[in-house]
Interface confidence: low
């Protein structure tokens, strides 16, 4: 973790007495003080003197003294190489330079794996002045490393615009095997080969992978990290971890449950959401998906009358959104309804069967035979025909409507007339002389109106021209003429 | 979160119309029913009737049928009811619910009420 | 139509009591269409209990609910000040959907 407090800036004592004009160069850095952690740039301080240029990671001093003695060139001082250590310990390590103090503005600053370090609370710079040179220790401080911390750090000094570069020290964070692959939970067919993948990282390596299936080790030999599973198969649900081991010890994955893929359960509650004479709307509740998704449904729709022939008639439908309209179904008819839901391993079983009607419609034809014939007599038109076959009636019949059509030279006026549901014929007044009659006929329910029949025409001709012959409309496929009597 | 919010409270005199609605949020509009219960001041609840926004397909109390006419607009999510011919015994604060119709029948989430005052 | 008939129609308990709040249908019903609501003053009914036992999101274990056929009940185990409400019974078995008259739980 990464706390967010300074070192106080005061010398370190790693030397006795006045600071030497050079530092030694086996100088070993503590591992174990605790300093604060956070990243901050280092604050430097140097006396300031005349620059000189320097190429390279090492400084070449142009300017010699009064005495003409050439300066030595400017590098870092060796230090520690690799650092290993476990996770969660505090480590700390400097590197070290002697700078003549001819030299002005000189900055140093950390740097891991090529990137610098901005904002390194643990980063700390001390100075020692001499009268000819200025030794400079620049500490990093880590308080609780964690695998993130490691990598190739170094110090860069800037001198007068040119840069020095100290060797790496390499940081080695050393804990238990870290997971960056688990296996994950999966349904799967039965008896069908799967596999599962396990990959963790140290350091340090290697890491060695042990698999668990119920509580139980698959594999009486590691696996070096990553490492994949092959199940051949299973026949019951079962639950799979992996163990990754290192030198540090052992980190154990999640467990994750395998699914064996089964028909689905049957839906349940089916429900009756809406009748009318020719369609209902259901729905249900989906039963258990059996670990694989609902691909379809199918509607089972048989009528509930015992004199049926049991003819079974299937609607396929979508699984969502759990409701469907039955259509083309006869009117006033009772139905046994059950559906069934398939996932990709089958079908369902039925769901419990349900019983729902029609309501009553509207005829869906028209009466037949209609015959329409002049009784000048009694100047009525007589009207006979034959009532729809029941099953097309699609209700209780309650009466007909009878339309009739009066043309004469340019007039035309229709009437209506209800009759009732025990009649076959109907008698009207002649309205209009010298003129055309035109007759319809439809049944009625309490479902409403159904079609009217085709048009009947009869001339009813001026008073004392009489014309027994009939009109007609013929029944349905028979060709030959209906004989009134 | 599913949220159900209804439009403001309004007064009405005898024989006009009102119109409540109810805009969804925070689920798929058109898979579940939109039910319309009402609460007269100091009484119990009463079913108005639902509507299922894929299709319009409606369902009334027959109480209500032929007064109360529920629509919806699935492209803003939004529910409607509108009572016509309305009479000071329609004094009710007004609910749209969320029906969850698996097997039957129940509100999982409730408007906020719209409180509608029938007076002269 | 299907009546619903909570008892009581008022109750004043104190708190930490176990109260009960029946409610019977006209007509039987499965258990899976009855359900419970809980109102409080000036806010929106709130489902507590569906298909006569299962809690809604939320809802404090010290509610229950049982019964099936005609008569179901809905149970308060260790009663808090905060139960103070109405509650309603439902059914969802036929239209039209109905409720009970309302049960007024007041804490003493």
């Known amino acids: 973790a990464i706390t967010e407090a300074r070192e106080e800036a005061k010398p370190y004592p790693l030397f006795p007495g006045p600071f030497p004009g050079s530092l030694q160069t086996d100088h070993t850095p503590l591992l174990s003080l605790p300093h604060a952690s956070g990243y901050q740039p280092a604050l430097m301080f140097s006396p300031t003197q005349p620059g000189r240029p320097h190429t390279g990671n090492v400084a070449i001093p142009q300017v010699t003294s009064v005495e003409s003695k050439p300066l030595p060139p400017l590098a870092f001082k060796h230090t520690v190489g690799h650092i290993i250590l476990s996770e969660h310990k505090g480590v700390k390590f400097n590197c070290s330079i002697s700078v003549p103090n001819i030299y002005q503005d000189t900055t140093i600053s950390w740097w891991k794996d090529g990137k610098e370090l901005l904002g390194a609370h643990h980063a700390i710079t001390q100075f020692y002045p001499d009268d000819e040179v200025t030794a400079i220790i620049a500490s990093f401080s880590i308080t609780s490393v964690q695998r993130s911390d490691n990598g190739s750090y170094i110090c860069k000094m800037k001198i007068n615009n040119e840069e020095i570069v100290s060797d790496p020290i390499y940081i080695e964070v050393q804990g238990l095997p870290h997971f960056t692959k688990q296996p994950e939970s999966m349904n799967v067919t039965r008896n069908t080969a799967f596999n599962l993948t396990c990959q963790a990282v140290g350091p340090p390596e290697p890491v060695n992978i042990f698999w668990v299936q119920n509580s139980s080790r698959v594999n009486e030999q590691p696996e070096k990290s990553p490492s994949v599973l092959t199940v051949p198969g299973l026949t019951e649900m079962a639950v799979f971890s992996c163990e990754a081991h290192n030198d540090k010890g052992l980190t154990v994955s999640k467990g994750v449950q395998i699914n064996i893929k089964a028909i689905p359960s049957p839906p349940t509650e089916v429900s009756i959401r809406n009748s009318t004479a020719h369609s209902i709307l259901i729905s249900w509740v989906p039963g258990f998906d059996g670990y694989s998704p609902f691909r379809n449904c199918s509607i089972q729709v048989k009528e509930a009358d015992p004199l049926s022939n049991g003819s079974v008639m299937i609607f396929n439908t979508s699984a969502l959104p759990h409701l469907y309209q039955i259509k083309q179904l006869q009117a006033l008819a009772n139905y046994s309804i059950g559906v069934s839901c398939m996932n990709e391993i089958g079908w369902s079983a039925v769901s419990p069967w349900i019983l729902a009607s029609t309501t009553e419609g509207a005829p869906s034809v028209a009466p037949l035979n209609v015959t329409v014939f002049l009784n000048e007599s009694s100047d009525n038109v007589d009207i006979r025909w034959m009532k729809p076959p029941t099953k097309q009636q699609d209700g209780e019949l309650v009466g007909y409507r009878i339309s009739h059509v009066w043309q004469s030279a340019g007039i035309s006026k229709e009437l209506l007339e209800e009759v009732g549901q025990n009649g076959s014929r109907a008698r009207i007044s002649v309205q209009v002389h010298n003129a055309t009659c035109t007759v319809r006929i439809a049944a009625v329910t309490r479902g409403g109106v159904g079609p009217f029949s085709d048009p009947v025409k009869i001339f009813i001709p001026a008073h004392g021209w009489v014309d027994y012959a009939p009109s007609s409309t013929p029944a349905p496929g028979n060709a030959d003429p209906v004989l009134i009597i | 979160q599913v949220q159900l919010v209804q439009s403001g409270a309004e007064v009405k005199k005898p024989g006009a119309s009102v119109k409540v609605s109810c805009k969804a949020s925070?689920?798929?509009?058109?898979?579940?029913?939109i039910n319309w219960v009402r609460q007269a001041p100091g009484q119990g609840l009463e079913w108005i009737g639902w509507i299922y926004p894929r299709d319009g397909y409606t369902k009334y109390n027959e109480k209500f049928k032929g007064r109360a006419t529920m629509t919806t607009d699935t492209s803003t999510s939004t529910a409607y009811m509108e009572l016509r011919s309305l009479r000071s015994d329609d004094t009710a604060v007004y609910f749209c619910t969320r029906g969850y119709y698996d097997n039957l029948y129940y509100f999982d989430y409730w408007g906020q009420g719209t409180t509608v005052t029938v007076s002269s | 139509e299907i009546v619903l008939t909570q008892s009581p129609d008022f109750q004043s308990v104190t708190p930490k009591e176990k109260v009960t709040i029946t409610c019977s249908a006209s007509s039987i019903i499965s258990s899976n269409y009855f359900h419970w609501y809980q109102q409080k003053p000036d806010q929106s009914p709130k489902l507590l209990i569906y298909r006569t036992s299962n809690l809604a999101s939320g809802v404090p274990s010290r509610f229950s609910g049982s019964g099936s056929g005609t008569d179901y009940t809905l149970t308060i185990n260790s009663l808090e000040a905060e139960d103070a409400a109405t509650y309603y019974c439902q059914q969802g078995r036929s239209v039209p959907l109905t409720f009970g008259q309302g049960t007024k739980l007041e804490i003493k």
């Open positions: 925070g689920y798929t509009f058109t898979t579940y029913d």
